[in-house]
Interface confidence: low
């Protein structure tokens, strides 16, 4: 039968043959009457056989990781007969691995993303080396991690290539690290081959920053002509972390005056300084608030590092602005009887300068003939008013800075005329009677009424009366109705238009003002020549006639 | 704050072995790595090894055969041992520590000369 | 030869703005590895001067800044002091060598 051991050839032999075994036929006897021969994939081109003494030789390098075994198969024949000796066998070639292949890491490029601040022993990522070479030779594919750079903040496990964290770190220092990995095959020992990696370590953000203000006072202006809700300027604290961790808001911790709030521009993480209520230079010319400053978003883990909220002071100085002369009034209204004499007092209007250097002020008086004001503010008449021709006067009364005649402010100041009895009764309309020839005693001749151009206070009410002449002499009587009306009547029966054409006849008409007034007023009463029913048309043919100069008989 | 300081001889014959010590001052050996850096006279900066407190060590390819740096946690030293040193070796030698990836800590530095 | 290729010197009248570039590949600066800038006074040690590319240790005034692109990074000086007459390297971690390398250094000179 066959005698052969197992056969192993080295891999990357550089020799240009070397001795992989002995195959022979246990018939052999050494006399070299067998032929040995090789069959098979690289039977000829890798490996030849001593075809006397069946001495196989390995003729080329070999590459384990290229081809571990080779399956040959070997005859051996008798020469002197040409006869197999043994039954054709098929018998196998190992390479046996050396450790020519060093570890590489396939899945490169490495990335892990570790929060910051994370404890030691968290687990970051596992690199993989793979070496080629054969795990079940030795030690030649047995690796060992080890890191060349990343002290002291990771480790990696020696046998699992895990990396894990050995020492907090901090975004805020440093918030990228390459780690630099090395794989040691033959497990570190002497003539093991190395390879390494690099793994970018990204440490994202965790909230352990407070905000904090960039300044401890910030000094602000505000006019103090400025309206509510105007900004008035911005303060800024500064977050160490980033994104939602770096969000803030802004509030008011101390604001005794409770005139300014503070609202947080979430764009630009700024505070904005507002105007809640109005200011006024010259009651408080300045102001100090304390603002403070903390995180929108802040896990309940996380609240060791946001005990105390960053505060800081705001300086608020008021703006003086030159504001126009301020009266004690919205409006004035004087009342001044008519018919006193020009220069008389009306009344007083005052103004003052808001600012604090209280200019003096100048007054005056927007288009008036009638009256005048000096720089104290006290208006008089320039003329003797007349309640009759105007009972009010709507004065427009503008004062003025004397320091910047540019500041001024205008009121309105109205004038009551009062009335006095100054004017007595008279009649409404023109009266013009007539009275026939024939006409008999007690016939109404004229019914007649009067006005005043007073005020009255209550009612008026007038008195009729003929003048004493006419009472005792007069062809005619008056009746007063009592009702601000009285009635002429004739006093006697027939009258003569020759002899006595026109009557003119004085009635006194009084009011009862105090002191009351008493009016004369003339009522013409012509005589006609009627008809028989009482037309007065002739008499008025006559009086037209007698009016325009033509005299009838 | 962290001082380092170098001692040794500061003449060595050639092909002897260099010696040098850092004694770590103001903070412990056990967290960080530790370099060895020297400077020619007149030239730049070259670095020579380092030592991570768990023993590992990494050593500039160009001196890797004849480099070895060792640590003695107890005394909060590390050491440096050059062989088969030549003239070119002459200069000032510095320890540092490694923060990262930058040495922010150096020792003032021992000119050591090489010369029969 | 050093990995990091800096000028050798560079230099400014007092009040002037310097800067000295860091040139760096892609096994160092090119593959995301940060740059950092030391300062060596005449006879001292050197001191951190900008890490992590732009950011400045407590105590370093804010006329020096860093900023990095691409390969590259460079280290600005603006109103320029006597006092900041000194040698300047960059540095940073080289994947190909599994270690630490620094530039040649510049050397800063202040005019007048």
């Known amino acids: 039968g066959w005698v052969w051991n197992q056969f192993f050839v080295p891999e990357e032999m550089n020799t240009t043959s070397h001795h992989v075994g002995r195959l022979r036929s246990d018939l052999d006897n050494g006399n070299n009457s067998f032929q040995y021969k090789l069959l098979g994939a690289g039977a000829g081109s890798t490996f030849i056989i001593d075809e006397r003494t069946g001495d196989i030789y390995a003729i080329e390098k070999l590459d384990r990781e290229e081809r571990s075994l080779y399956i040959l198969r070997a005859q051996v024949i008798d020469i002197t007969t040409g006869r197999a000796v043994e039954p054709e066998s098929e018998f196998v070639i190992k390479v046996s691995d050396i450790n020519d292949n060093e570890p590489k890491f396939l899945d490169e490029p490495y990335e892990a993303i570790v929060p910051e601040m994370s404890p030691e022993g968290t687990l970051v990522i596992q690199v993989t080396a793979s070496d080629a070479d054969d795990p079940s030779s030795g030690n030649n594919a047995r690796l060992l991690y080890s890191l060349l750079q990343g002290q002291p903040y990771f480790s990696v496990e020696p046998t699992t290539g895990v990396i894990r964290i050995s020492s907090k770190m901090d975004r805020e220092l440093q918030d990228e690290y390459w780690v630099i990995i090395q794989a040691k095959d033959m497990i570190g020992q002497p003539g093991a081959l190395s390879g390494t990696t690099s793994v970018l370590i990204k440490l994202s953000d965790v909230n352990d920053n407070k905000p904090i203000f960039k300044e401890s006072l910030y000094r602000l202006t505000v006019s103090e002509s400025a309206p509510t809700g105007t900004s008035i300027g911005t303060i800024m604290a500064y977050d160490n972390d980033i994104g939602e961790n770096a969000e803030m808001d802004y509030s008011i911790e101390e604001d005794d005056s409770q005139t300014f709030d503070i609202i947080t521009n979430h764009e630009t993480q700024e505070g904005i300084v507002i105007l809640k209520k109005k200011v006024n230079f010259e009651h408080q010319n300045h102001y100090g608030i304390r603002a403070k400053v903390k995180n929108h978003h802040v896990d309940e883990q996380l609240m060791k590092y946001h005990t105390e909220a960053s505060t800081t002071f705001i300086k608020i100085q008021v703006e003086d602005v030159d504001e126009p002369p301020l009266f004690l009034l919205p409006y004035y209204i004087f009342e001044i009887f008519e018919e006193t004499p020009q220069g008389s007092f009306v009344g007083v209007v005052s103004a003052t300068d808001p600012d604090n250097r209280k200019s003096p002020i100048r007054y005056s008086i927007t288009r008036s003939k009638v009256f005048n004001i000096d720089d104290n503010g006290t208006i008089t008449t320039t003329n003797s008013l007349d309640r009759e021709i105007s009972a009010w006067y709507n004065l427009s009364i503008t004062a003025t800075e004397k320091y910047n005649i540019e500041q001024i402010s205008s009121i309105p100041v109205y004038v009551q005329v009062l009335n006095i009895n100054d004017h007595a009764p008279e009649f409404s309309q023109y009266y013009e009677s007539y009275v026939c020839e024939n006409a008999g005693s007690g016939q109404v001749i004229q019914t007649i009424s009067a006005v005043d151009r007073d005020e009255s206070i209550e009612e008026h009410h007038f008195y009729f009366n003929l003048s004493v002449e006419d009472t005792n002499s007069s062809s005619f009587t008056i009746i007063d109705n009592q009702d601000n009306t009285a009635v002429i009547l004739t006093n006697r029966t027939g009258f003569n238009l020759q002899e006595e054409p026109i009557f003119y006849i004085s009635i006194l008409i009084a009011d009862n003002g105090i002191p009351s007034l008493t009016s004369t007023n003339t009522l013409t009463i012509h005589v006609c020549d009627c008809d028989d029913s009482g037309s007065t048309q002739t008499c008025q043919y006559q009086e037209l006639m007698l009016s325009m100069g033509f005299k009838t008989e | 704050q962290v001082q380092l300081q170098e001692s040794g001889p500061g003449l060595v014959k050639p092909s002897e072995t260099l010696s040098l010590t850092c004694t770590v001052s103001?903070?412990?050996?056990?967290?960080?790595?530790w370099s060895w850096i020297r400077q020619p006279p007149g030239k730049g900066l070259e670095w020579i090894g380092y030592?991570?407190?768990?023993?590992?060590?990494n050593y500039n390819p160009s001196l890797k055969s004849r480099v070895t740096i060792s640590l003695d946690t107890s005394k909060n030293q590390f050491s440096l041992k050059l062989s088969s040193v030549t003239a070119a070796d002459t200069a000032v030698y510095y320890c540092?520590?490694?923060?990262?990836?930058?040495?922010?800590?150096w020792g003032q530095g021992t000119l050591v000369t090489v010369s029969s | 030869q050093s990995v990091l290729t800096q000028p050798p010197s560079v230099s400014g009248a007092p009040g002037q703005r310097v800067t000295i570039s860091c040139t760096g590949s892609?096994?160092?600066?090119?593959?995301?590895?940060?740059v950092h800038w030391y300062q060596q006074l005449p006879g001292t040690a050197p001191k951190l001067l900008i890490h992590?590319?732009?950011n400045r240790p407590s105590g370093v005034p804010d006329r020096f800044s860093g900023s990095k692109s691409g390969t590259s990074a460079s280290l600005a000086i603006t109103g320029l002091q006597a006092e900041d007459e000194a040698d300047y390297y960059c540095?940073?971690?080289?994947?190909?060598?599994?270690?630490?390398?620094f530039g040649g250094g510049t050397r800063l000179t202040v005019l007048g």
């Open positions: 540092a520590r490694n923060w990262a990836f930058h040495f922010d800590y």
């Open positions: 103001g903070g412990s050996i056990s967290s960080y790595s």
């Open positions: 030592i991570y407190y768990s023993g590992s060590t």
């Open positions: 892609s096994s160092n600066i090119g593959t995301g590895y940060d």
């Open positions: 992590g590319n732009s």
């Open positions: 540095q940073s971690y080289d994947s190909s060598l599994s270690g630490w390398v």
